[in-house]
Amino acid sequence: CKAMHVAQPAVVLASSRGIASFVCEYASPGKATEVRVTVLRQADSQVTEVCAATYMMGNELTFLDDSICTGTSSGNQVNLTIQGLRAMDTGLYICKVELMYPPPYYLGIGNGTQIYVIDPEPCPDSDF
């Protein structure tokens, strides 16, 4: 089979600070040295890019400075963290992995992680 399998958890609950982390694992059919990981968000039938990073195997993932994502890699596993999430950001977050170099190119897309975000209740005023 020439398809690359990508696994990610079905559900993740964001912390009260709006941070969600999940692992994206891929079964590489080749020996890639350059890998691109993209997080997509699917809402209704629309798919948008949340963040993307290209990394060399053995090195750290580097997202753009203004990205809401951070991550680390270990072998064929990527630990992704998305921050700054609010209740309205609840949705399906899909891990997309591309083996960029050396050839051949492979694409793998996970089934998505449903991230639930609950905005914290505002602290009640106190008279202390």
Epitope: K2, V47, L107, I109
Partner: antibody
Framework: QVQLVESGGGVVQPGRSLRLSCAAS????????MHWVRQAPGKGLEWVAV????????YYADSVKGRFTFSRDNSKNTLYLQMNSLRAEDTAVYYC???????????WGQGTTVTVSS | DIQMTQSPSSLSASVGDRVTITCRAS??????LAWYQQKPGKVPKLLIY???TLQSGVPSRFSGSGSGTDFTLTISSLQPEDVATYYC?????????FGQGTKVEIK
């Protein structure tokens, strides 16, 4: 709106060169893999080449490898296909297409016609 | 390289008929399959990706199914505007191979 516009096609003699351009608008070119697909008269679709994101990685169909060069200028939001040593069998409509976020080609240009004939 | 084979190469059906086109990959490609519609003299248009997901704006009479090596595009009720050539394509690895196309005509 999101669109791709090809230009640069024409009639050229075998062995000569031609450069096609594809101007993208309505989206950020550097976020997508971009492809060229061609269609010979009365025939089906044939994938020609892809260029990735920052332009560092490219792949070509065996039929054009060593003769065609795909490049991109993200600052101008434009793609280029340099075609050298053209042959009669390169005669086709050339389409620029965007590899969508999920992999399929979701946006296509209107195409530009290349005729290689003596 | 993985080959994509479509059948039939052409078909003629009546308005309202259910039309089925099949596409077979020479090796398993999971669900990394797209279907395109190309009307005469026009640009190809994405209909379905991920084997069964309808592209935004595509009429619901179009549907896709399959996984691995065998895939199907179905038009539940053929309309005059569906006259076109339909192509399958695999996109999980290079090269991005298309099927040879299926020409759909109205009887």
């Amino acid at each position: 709106q999101v669109q791709l516009v090809e230009s640069g096609g024409g009639v050229v003699q075998p062995g000569r060169s031609l450069r096609l351009s594809c101007a993208a608008s309505g989206f950020t070119l550097s976020s997508y893999g971009m492809h060229w697909v061609r269609q010979a008269p009365g025939k089906g679709l044939e994938w020609v080449a892809v260029i990735w994101y920052d332009g560092s990685n490219k792949y070509y169909a065996d039929s054009v490898k060593g003769r065609f060069t795909f490049s991109r200028d993200n600052s101008k939001n434009t793609l280029y296909l340099q075609m050298n040593s053209l042959r009669a069998e390169d005669t086709a409509v050339y389409y620029c297409a965007r590899g969508g976020l999920t992999g399929a080609f979701d946006i296509w240009g209107q195409g530009t016609t290349v005729t290689v004939s003596s | 390289d993985i080959q994509m084979t479509q059948s039939p190469s052409s078909l003629s059906a009546s308005v309202g008929d259910r039309v089925t086109i099949t596409c077979r990959a020479s090796q398993g490609i999971s669900n990394y399959l797209a279907w395109y519609q190309q009307k005469p003299g026009k640009v190809p248009k994405l209909l379905i990706y991920a084997a069964s997901t309808l592209q935004s704006g595509v009429p619901s009479r179009f549907s896709g199914s399959g996984s691995g090596t065998d895939f199907t595009l179905t038009i539940s009720s053929l309309q005059p505007e569906d006259v076109a050539t339909y192509y399958c394509q695999k996109y999980n690895s290079a090269p991005w191979t298309f099927g040879q196309g299926t020409k759909v005509e109205i009887k």
